[in-house]
């Protein structure tokens, strides 16, 4: 964590990416502890900000405004040196979000990927952003930054993520910034959950009363496994949304979830996946596909009695 011998380490919590109106703590770690320190904002020519005040342990900034965006450094107290202060710390960039319209975020080929694959996350906007930033929820590192490419009145950037492993699964958001205000970011894009499959053994998927049913007959799909999955996810080919249910332990020592599909009106191919509460975005191998056929008079769609999850929210715990 520490820099050189006489260099403090400046960090921010909970994040270096802070929304307008949020609060952030700047901590200056120096010589195996938190000492008195001074803060500098680089666009103020290294003049101590906050009227030369001296802070202990941390300084809380907020509610933050666009003016708080920028590069900060600190100097730790060193009473016996010539100046009384250490060398400047590492630069710490604080980015303030919520200053422009949100961009859009898409995953190519899609948000559900196998371990080892690569995904392209494309951030785009009709606002002429100079830079795009990609941030994964829950990590304290600075967001990835790319220069926007402008084409046909749209600015965009393609972030390549991979080869995919569990640590890269999660909820992503992107932001844009305009020229001359590189750290005053837009509102965040809608969240996009990147799910990695193929890490655990596949569950089995069955249909009650069976995979071939009469139109109007009630159908339930059961996903089960000997593995102690916390959650099961059911997807239907051609549908963007998945459904999820908490797994229930059964007397035969399997873990099962029963998805009621309601009265059968339309067939389809279904798959299910298992996941654990601790890693909600890391899923098992897919079950074998199950083709549900409806005989009689199928209509154009199957009602959804269980509420489908939105395009995001997969990577949240199911409470």
């Amino acid at each position: 964590l520490m820099g050189g011998q006489d260099k403090p380490f400046l960090s921010a919590r909970p994040s270096t990416v802070v929304p307008r109106g949020g609060h952030v703590a700047l901590q200056c770690h120096y010589r195996r502890g938190f000492n008195n320190f001074m803060l500098y904002k680089e666009d103020r020519s290294h003049v101590p900000i906050f009227h030369g005040r001296i802070f202990q342990e941390s300084f809380i900034m907020g509610p933050v405004t666009p003016a708080h965006a920028g590069t900060y450094r600190c100097r730790g107290s060193r009473p016996h040196s010539l100046t009384g202060w250490s060398a400047p710390s590492n630069p710490l960039v604080i980015m303030v979000t919520g200053n422009h319209r949100k961009p859009s975020l898409l995953a190519h080929p899609g948000p559900l990927l196998k371990s080892g694959e690569t995904v392209i996350l494309q951030c785009w906007s009709d606002v002429m952003f100079e830079h795009f930033f990609l941030h994964r929820e829950g990590i304290s590192e600075d967001p990835s930054r790319l220069v926007g490419q402008i084409h046909d009145g749209v600015s965009k950037a393609n972030f390549s993520i991979g080869p995919l492993m569990p640590v890269l699964a999660g909820t992503y958001r992107c932001y844009g910034s305009v020229p001359h205000s590189p750290y005053q970011l837009s509102a965040p894009s809608d969240p996009l959950d990147i799910v990695i499959t193929g890490l655990y053994e596949k569950p089995s998927l069955s249909a009650q009363p069976g995979p071939t049913v009469q139109a109007g007959e009630n159908v339930t799909l059961s996903c089960s496994s000997w593995s102690s999955y916390d959650i099961y996810h059911l997807s239907r080919e051609g549908e963007a949304h998945e459904r999820r249910l908490r797994a229930v332990p059964k007397v035969n020592r399997t873990f099962q979830a029963d998805f009621p599909l309601g009265p059968a009106t339309h067939g389809g191919t279904y798959r299910c996946f298992g996941s654990f509460r601790a890693l909600p975005c890391v899923w098992s191998n897919s079950s074998d596909p199950l083709l549900v056929s409806v005989t009689g008079n199928p209509s154009s769609s199957w009602p959804s009695p269980t509420e489908p999850s939105s395009k995001s929210g997969i990577c949240r715990h199911l409470h």
Partner: antibody
């Protein structure tokens, strides 16, 4: 002790403006941001916006951007919220509230509320 | 903007009961959450800040828990003075939105 005392109830005609005041005492006025919250009859709470009395910086909820103007007078430790172009749906209780200090601060002190009634 | 979904919207309970009110944020709010109690015709009063910290003078039967997007206010052994409306509010960026409120009534 910290106190936020708001001005009295207002009855206004549609299209008129009113200015609600919030006088702070018991703390350094310029060291805390002052926020305004609205509660329509029988409804929940809505954050309107805030002012930093030290710098004059204001930020508004987009919903109220053209409706409210926030100001502060450091010499009297008073925050003001002006409501303009009043309509019947602006009838509500308006509260001022102080945002506390710390990394995770709440609204630690509230005014008693000012009822604004818009009626012809 | 961050949405705060509070549930239930109303709740009937008896003196001595234990009740739980939940608040879900549309994104991670890093524990930037407060709970308030409001009685009829009065200003809200702070109960819990930073998701888990009890405000000064608040009885210990009140407690807050949660992190990320999911937060809970629990009242152990309800007292007659606890029947009121409760609101959560996030502070992770403006607008600082409130939950829709939970009206706690005597059964």
């Amino acid at each position: 002790q910290v106190q936020l005392v708001q001005s009295g109830a207002e009855l206004a005609r549609p299209g008129a403006s009113v200015k609600v005041s919030c006088k702070a005492s018991g703390y350094t006025f310029t060291s805390y941001t002052m926020h305004w919250v609205r509660q329509a009859p029988g409804q929940g709470l809505e954050w309107i916006g805030y002012i930093n009395p030290s710098s004059g910086y204001t930020e508004n909820n987009r919903k109220f951007k053209d409706k409210t103007t926030l100001t502060a007078d450091k010499s009297t430790s008073t925050a003001y919220m002006e409501l303009s172009s009043l309509r019947s749906e602006d009838t509500a209780v308006y509260y001022c509230a102080r945002l506390g200090k710390g990394l995770l601060p709440p609204f630690d002190y509230w005014g008693q509320g000012t009822t604004v009634t818009v009626s012809s | 903007d961050i949405q705060m979904t509070q549930s239930p919207s109303s709740l009937s309970a008896s003196v001595g009961d234990r009740v739980t009110i939940t608040c879900r944020a549309s994104e991670n709010i890093y524990s930037n959450l407060a709970w308030y109690q409001q009685k009829q015709g009065k200003a809200p009063q702070l109960l819990v800040y930073a998701a888990t910290n009890l405000a000064d003078g608040v009885p210990s039967r009140f407690s807050g828990s949660g992190s990320g997007t999911q937060y809970t206010l629990t009242i152990n052994s309800l007292q007659p003075e606890d029947f009121a409306t409760y609101y959560c509010q996030h502070f992770w960026g403006t607008p600082y939105t409130f939950g829709g409120g939970t009206k706690l009534e005597i059964k």
